[in-house]
C-alpha cells in the first residue's frame, strides 16, 4: 500500500493550506495590533497560565484522546494539532471582527488567545466523529466553517440573550457535539469488507488515549473557570468542576465494570466517562452553591456516559457511521444537554430568590438560547458535511478509512501497525 497522498491531494492540500495561511497573515498585518496597555507583568504570567492550560487540553488532551484507533493514531494527534493551530488564528480574527472591529483595529490580548483556543476546542470535539474518514484539506474546511459558526452563534447569543462570555462559550459542548454528529451523518457511512479492523482500538493507542483523558481531566477546571468575572466565581468553578470530575472517574470505572457481564472495565467507556462531570457542570459550575451538588451531578453524568457508551454506539454506527470508539459526539451531546438543564433549574431558583416574578420569561430565554445553539450547530454541520462531500477535496476512499499509511511516510510499512 503506498504511503503517499493521492496526487490530486498533494496538489490540493499544500496550495489550499498555504494560501489560507498567507491570507491569515495579511489579515493580521492589516487589521490587528497588540494590546499596548499592559502594565502588570505578574498579571501577564497568571493570565498566560490559564491560556497554557487550555492549549495543553487541546493539543495533548483532545489530541491523544482521539488517538485510540489501531491504524489511525498518528493522524489523530497530528491532525488535531493542525486544526488547533489553524482554528486559533481564525478565531482570534473572527472574534476581533465581530466584537471590536467597528472601533478600528482588532486588539490582541492574552484573553483573545484564551477565547480563540476555546473556540478551536469546539472543532477538536466535533472532529472525533469524522476523524479517519476525511483528509487534511477537508479538515481545513471544517475548521473554517465551525469556528465561524461558533463565533457568530456567540455574538448572536451575547446580543440577543444578553449572556456573558462564560455562558455563551459553555454552549460549546452541545454545539460541538451536534455539529460533529451532523457532519458525520453526511459522510459516506458503510465500511467496506476487510477494513473493519482499522476502526478497532489497540493497546498502545488506547494507552495514549487514556493519557489524553488524564490531561483533560487535570485541566478541565481551568476550562470551566477561564471566562468567569470574579475571583469568587472562578474559585467556585474550579472546586465544583474538580468534585464533579473526581466523582465521574469513580462512577465511570465502577459503572463500566457493572455494565460488563464478566465485570470487566471497558477502555472506551473510561476514556470519555472520566470527563463526564466536567461537561455536565460546565454551564453552571460557578453557580453550584455546595460541593455535594457538584458531586451528585458528576455521579449522574458518569452513569449517563457509561450508559450512553453501552447502548448508543450501535445506533450511531448504523445511522451516522461513527465507530464504536468515537463516543465523544453523543457523550457530549447528552451531557451538554444535562448541563444546560441544570443551568435552567438554577436560573429558576435564582429568579425566585430575587423575587423577580419573571420565571417563565427567564426559562424561555434559556431554552431559546439552547435551541439556537443546536439549530446553528445542525445547520452549519450539515453545510460542512455537504461541502466535504465535494469531489474537489479528493476524500479518502472508504477502503482507506482509518489508515495512517494514506497520510504518513513510514520507513517500514508494517501491516500490523
Amino acid at each position: 500500500m503506498s504511503s503517499k497522498y493521492p496526487r490530486s491531494v498533494r496538489r490540493c492540500l499544500p496550495l489550499w493550506a498555504l494560501t489560507l495561511e498567507a491570507a491569515l497573515i495579511l489579515l493580521f498585518y492589516f487589521f490587528t495590533h497588540y494590546d499596548a496597555s499592559l502594565e502588570d507583568q505578574k498579571g501577564l504570567v497568571a493570565s498566560y497560565q490559564v491560556g497554557q492550560d487550555l492549549t495543553v487540553m487541546a493539543a495533548i488532551g483532545l489530541g491523544f484522546l482521539t488517538s485510540s484507533f489501531r491504524r489511525h493514531s498518528w493522524s489523530s494527534v497530528a491532525f488535531n494539532l493542525f486544526m488547533l493551530a489553524l482554528g486559533v488564528q481564525w478565531a482570534i480574527l473572527l472574534d476581533g471582527f465581530l466584537s471590536q472591529f467597528p472601533s478600528g483595529k482588532v486588539v490582541i490580548t492574552l484573553f483573545s488567545i484564551r477565547l480563540a483556543t476555546m473556540s478551536a476546542l469546539s472543532v477538536l470535539i466535533s472532529v472525533d466523529a469524522v476523524l479517519g474518514k476525511v483528509n487534511l484539506a477537508q479538515l481545513v474546511v471544517m475548521v473554517l466553517v465551525e469556528v465561524t459558526a461558533l463565533g457568530n452563534l456567540r455574538m448572536v447569543i451575547s446580543n440577543i440573550f444578553n449572556t456573558d462570555y462564560h455562558m455563551n462559550m459553555m454552549h460549546i459542548y452541545v454545539f460541538a457535539a451536534y455539529f460533529g454528529l451532523s457532519v458525520a451523518w453526511c459522510l459516506p457511512k458503510p465500511l467496506p469488507e476487510g477494513t473493519e479492523d482499522k476502526d478497532q482500538t489497540a493497546t498502545i493507542p488506547s494507552l495514549s488515549a487514556m493519557l489524553g483523558a488524564l490531561f483533560l481531566w487535570m485541566f478541565w477546571p481551568s476550562f470551566n473557570s477561564a471566562l468567569l468575572r470574579s475571583p469568587i466565581e472562578r474559585k467556585n468553578a474550579v472546586f465544583n468542576t474538580y468534585y464533579a470530575v473526581a466523582v465521574s472517574v469513580v462512577t465511570a470505572i465502577s459503572g463500566s465494570s457493572l455494565a460488563h457481564p464478566q465485570g470487566k472495565i471497558s477502555k472506551t467507556y473510561v476514556h470519555s466517562a472520566v470527563l463526564a462531570g466536567g461537561v455536565a457542570v460546565g454551564t453552571s459550575c460557578h453557580l453550584i452553591p455546595s460541593p455535594w451538588l457538584a458531586m451528585v451531578l458528576g455521579l449522574v453524568a458518569g452513569l449517563i456516559s457509561v450508559g450512553g457508551a453501552k447502548y448508543l454506539p450501535g445506533c450511531c454506527n448504523r445511522v451516522l457511521g461513527i465507530p464504536h470508539s468515537s463516543i465523544m459526539g453523543y457523550n457530549f451531546s447528552l451531557l451538554g444537554l444535562l448541563g444546560e438543564i441544570i443551568y435552567i433549574v438554577l436560573l429558576v431558583l435564582d429568579t425566585v430568590g430575587a423575587g423577580n416574578g419573571m420565571i417563565g420569561f427567564q426559562v424561555l430565554l434559556s431554552i431559546g438560547e439552547l435551541s439556537l445553539a443546536i439549530v446553528i450547530a445542525l445547520m452549519s454541520g450539515l453545510l460542512t458535511g455537504l461541502l466535504l462531500n465535494l469531489k474537489i477535496w479528493k476524500a479518502p476512499h472508504e477502503a482507506k478509512y482509518f489508515d495512517d499509511q494514506v497520510f504518513w511516510k513510514f520507513p517500514h510499512l508494517a501491516v500490523g501497525f
Epitope: L38, G43, S47, T351, N356, M358
Partner: antibody, heavy 127, light 107 residues
Amino acid sequence: EVQLVETGGGVVQPGRSLRLSCAASGFSFSNYGMHWVRQAPGKGLEWVAVIWFDGSIKYYVDSVKGRFTISRDNSKNTLYLQMNSLRAEETAIYFCARENSVLVPGTIRRRYYLDYWGQGTLVTVSS
Amino acid sequence: DIQLTQSPSSLSASVGDRVTITCRASQSISSYLNWYQQKPGEAPKLLIYVASTLQSGAPSRFSGSGSGTDYTLTISSLQPEDSATFYCQQTYSPPYTFGQGTKLEIK
C-alpha cells in the same frame, strides 16, 4: 480604610491625549473589578469603562470605544484610563470606583455594584 | 443598551415627608440595580444595591424595592441632610448605564 485617589486631570486641547491614574489602598486591589465614571459640569453620571480583576476583560461605553483604554497594574495597585483624541464634550470630572459583588440569599448569580468611589479628577478639553 | 428612566427629574419635599423615586429599565434587569446619592461637590455614595439591600452605613430610612423592569427608592422620613441628587444604575449588562438623576430639594 478603602481609598481611591485619582490624578492626571488637567486642561488639554481637543484631539490630544491624557492619562488618568487611580491609586488604590486599604483593600486587596487585585481581587476587584474597577470602573471609570464621568460627570460633565452640571450633568448626570455617565459610566465610561470597566476592567475585570485580572485585566482580562474590558468594556467601554460606545462613545469612547477605540479612543479610551482602561488598564490596571495589580502590582502597583493602580488603575489607568488612557484617553486619546479627546473632545470638548468630554470635559468632566472623572471618578474611579471599586466594583463589589454579592450573592443575595436565595439567588445563585452574583450581583455587582460600585461600593467605593474616589473624589474625582477634573479633565477640561478646551482650545 | 439598557436605558434607565428616573422619575421625577426633580422634586421638593418637607422634612418628615415620605419620598419615592422610581427607576424604569428598558428591559428586565433581574434586580441588578443600585442606587447612589450624590451631594454637590462630592463623589457619589452607594445607598442601595441589588434593588433592596441597604449599604452598611447608610441610614435605615432609605429602602429599595422592585423587580423586573420597575424599581423604587423610598425615603421614609425625609431629613435635611438628604438634599442631594439620586441616581439608579444597572449592572445587568455593559454598558452599565445610570439613570438621568433625581434632584431632591428640602422645602
